[in-house]
Each structure stands twice: as C-alpha cells, then as structure tokens.
Amino acid sequence: QKSSIEKCSVDIQQSRNKTTERPGLLNCPIYWQQLREKCLLFSHTVNPWNNSLADCSTKESSLLLIRDKDELIHTQNLIRDKAILFWIGLNFSLSEKNWKWINGSFLNSNDLEIRGDAKENSCISISQTSVYSEYCSTEIRWICQKELTPVRNKVYPDS
C-alpha cells in the first residue's frame, strides 16, 4: 500500500520518463545556479513536499538528489541563512520502511546524518548545517536540479 506522497512521487517520475528525449543541457538556463555538473534552482517561496516535487517537474527538473556528503556540503555552502530549510528529493517509503530518493534508489546510511524520525509522511530537508526529517506537509522552500551533460574532451574545474 503506497502513501499519497509515494504515489505522487511515482506518478511524476513516470510522466517525466514518458516525455520525449531532449538534447543534453550544456549550460545552466536563466536563473539556475551551476554547482559542478548540476544546475540548481533555490526557491524563495514555500510549499509542502509534494507541491515542491510538482513545481520542479513543471520545470523539467527534479527535487535535488544528493550523491554523497561532499555534494551535500557544496550545496549547503550555497544556503545563505542558517534558519532556512529546503526540501530535497528524499522521503520515507512506508512500504519499504526506508528512506527513498525520488529516482527510486534507497539512501545509503553513510551519506546523510538525518536529524529526526524515519516514519510515515516524513520528508527530508536540508539547512546550511544539517539534514532534517520533517512532516511532508510542512511548508518550506525547496531546491530543484537539472543535470548538465558532460562534454567529452573538456575538463571543467569545480564551480
């Protein structure tokens, strides 16, 4: 039995997969901030997690996926205010009793040190310094991401 949050996440991911392939993204579009091989968009308005997920989807992007601690730290360096929280693309799967990224993969327990409970209707937010479990209905900001397409034979320094 999937929760409404899980169903929303799956539906949006499936609809994205159905869309026709677009040419790779070589540069970040207007308003997007480049961080290494990604383009990030930080909201200045607030939404519950599923609305944030949907907003990113309308921009042909996804809520932020964080590969490892290093990427987390680099992303947190772009957060200016200590008290502000941002949704990322990670929520608690009740059916699998585990944290699950919106791309379907599970959280490696070593990647993020989450403060708070792992339970139904919990979604993950990040701040300048920490990672938190919050009720998915909480209205906070969010971060969308687009992947940049690597260009062969070119070496880009870190942003």
Epitope: Y31, T45, T58, R80, R141
Partner: antibody, heavy 121, light 108 residues
Framework: QVQLQESGPGLVKPSETLSLTCTVS????????WSWIRQPPGKGLEWIGY???????NYNPSLKSRVTISIDTSENQFSLKLTSVTAADTAVYYC???????????????WGQGTLVTVSS | EIVLTQSPGTLSLSPGERATLSCRAS???????LAWYQQKPGQAPRLLIY???SRATGIPDRFSGSGSGTDFTLTISRLEPEDFAVYYC?????????FGQGTRLEIK
C-alpha cells in the same frame, strides 16, 4: 513592504564609468534576482543584467563587455558599473527585484523610482 | 534573443471600453514566462501579469492575460481613466530578458 532606492551621479562624462547603487529595504536580498533596467528618454525598456545573492550574474550580451553588477548582502545593496559610456547610454536607470521562475512568481515585482543619468561633457 | 513585437503601437479607446493588446514573440517563450507592465509618465513600470496569466498582487481583476508559445494577449475588460498608459510585455524564459517596444493606450 520591499523598497528599492537608486543612488549615484546624474551626470557622467563620455568615456568615463557610470556607477549606481541600489539599496533594498523591507525585505531580504537572499534568493531573489536583482536587476538593472534602463530606459532612454521617450523610448522602451532594456534589461542590463541581474545578480543573485551568491554573486552569480547574468548580463545582456549587448552590454556584457562594459557591465559589472556586484552585491553586498551585509548592506542589502547591489551596484552597477558601466564603462566607456557614450551619449547613447543616457537613460533613466531602474533597479528591480526579479522573482525568477520559482513557484507562483515571475517578473520584476518591485522597482526603484529610477534615476536619470545623462552622459555629456 | 527573443524579440517581442507589440501591437498596435497606439490604441485609442474611451473609458468603459474593452482593450486588447497583443504581444508576439519571435520564438516560443519557455513555460509561458511572460509578464505585462503598465507605465505612466515619470513613474517606474508596475507589474500587472506574470506567467502569462497570473495577476500580480493588488492588480484589479479587470486586467487579464492569456496566451502561450508565441502569442500573448493582455485584456482590460472595462477601461478606467487611470488605465491610460504605456504597456510593455516582457519574456523571462531565456536569456537575455527582453521587452516589447510598448503599446500606448490613449483616451479617444
């Protein structure tokens, strides 16, 4: 209520550098985009460029070689420098807040009152 | 860059009439990222519409926006005396941000 106020000299000599500052009050400078727009007398609007709180910028290619926009988040200010000015740069210069494309926002929702800069010897 | 062409250049109408202003883009405007502004003499422009059809805060409901792709319209359902001004469209879906040349709405 967010307010923007431009300041700087109203007269600049040809070949010199035009410098303006915009002070933001009543709101945070973070997570918005802060633009400069100009309007020559009796003409339309031209976007010059924007800056984000992180310092990343985006300039109009038609002016890119002459423009620098900088930001001071501690003072809630951002600034415009336009080098090698000519009479064609005479315009009312506006600063504005840009909501970007996140959520239910978009366009320049707050503007300064504008300051006329005349380029003349 | 995306070139925005507004028509007509000048529109002469009377208070109480309906005004229809057009903005045509040289290429499709991404996700309908199009805004409309009103500017009166000696004043800064005022945001009326963003996202092609969403009214900005405090804008009366006689102002409405529509359109997508390359064709956009600003409609003022019933003109009030204070509506006579210059109107600009602006796209913010791709860089550089560009404005139309403006439509002057004058009293007939």
């Amino acid at each position: 209520q967010v307010q923007l106020q431009e300041s700087g000299p109203g007269l600049v000599k040809p070949s010199e550098t035009l410098s303006l500052t915009c002070t933001v009050s009543g709101g945070s400078i973070s997570y918005y985009y802060w633009s400069w727009i100009r309007q020559p007398p009796g003409k339309g609007l031209e976007w010059i460029g924007y800056i984000y709180h992180s310092g990343s910028t985006n300039y109009n290619p038609s002016l890119k070689s002459r423009v620098t926009i900088s930001i001071d988040t501690s003072e809630n200010q951002f600034s415009l420098k336009l080098t090698s000015v000519t009479a064609a740069d005479t315009a009312v210069y506006y600063c504005a807040r840009d909501g970007g494309i996140v959520g239910a926002t978009g366009g320049f929702d707050y503007w300064g009152q504008g300051t006329l800069v005349t380029v003349s010897s | 860059e995306i070139v925005l062409t507004q028509s007509p250049g000048t529109l002469s109408l009377s208070p109480g009439e309906r005004a229809t202003l057009s903005c045509r883009a040289s290429q499709s405007v991404s996700s309908s990222y199009l805004a409309w502004y009103q500017q009166k003499p000696g004043q800064a422009p005022r945001l009326l519409i963003y996202g092609a059809s969403s009214r900005a805060t405090g804008i009366p409901d006689r102002f409405s926006g529509s359109g997508s792709g390359t064709d956009f319209t600003l409609t003022i359902s019933r003109l009030e005396p204070e509506d006579f001004a210059v109107y600009y469209c602006q796209q913010y879906g791709s860089s550089p941000i560009t404005f139309g040349q403006g439509t002057r709405l004058e009293i007939k």
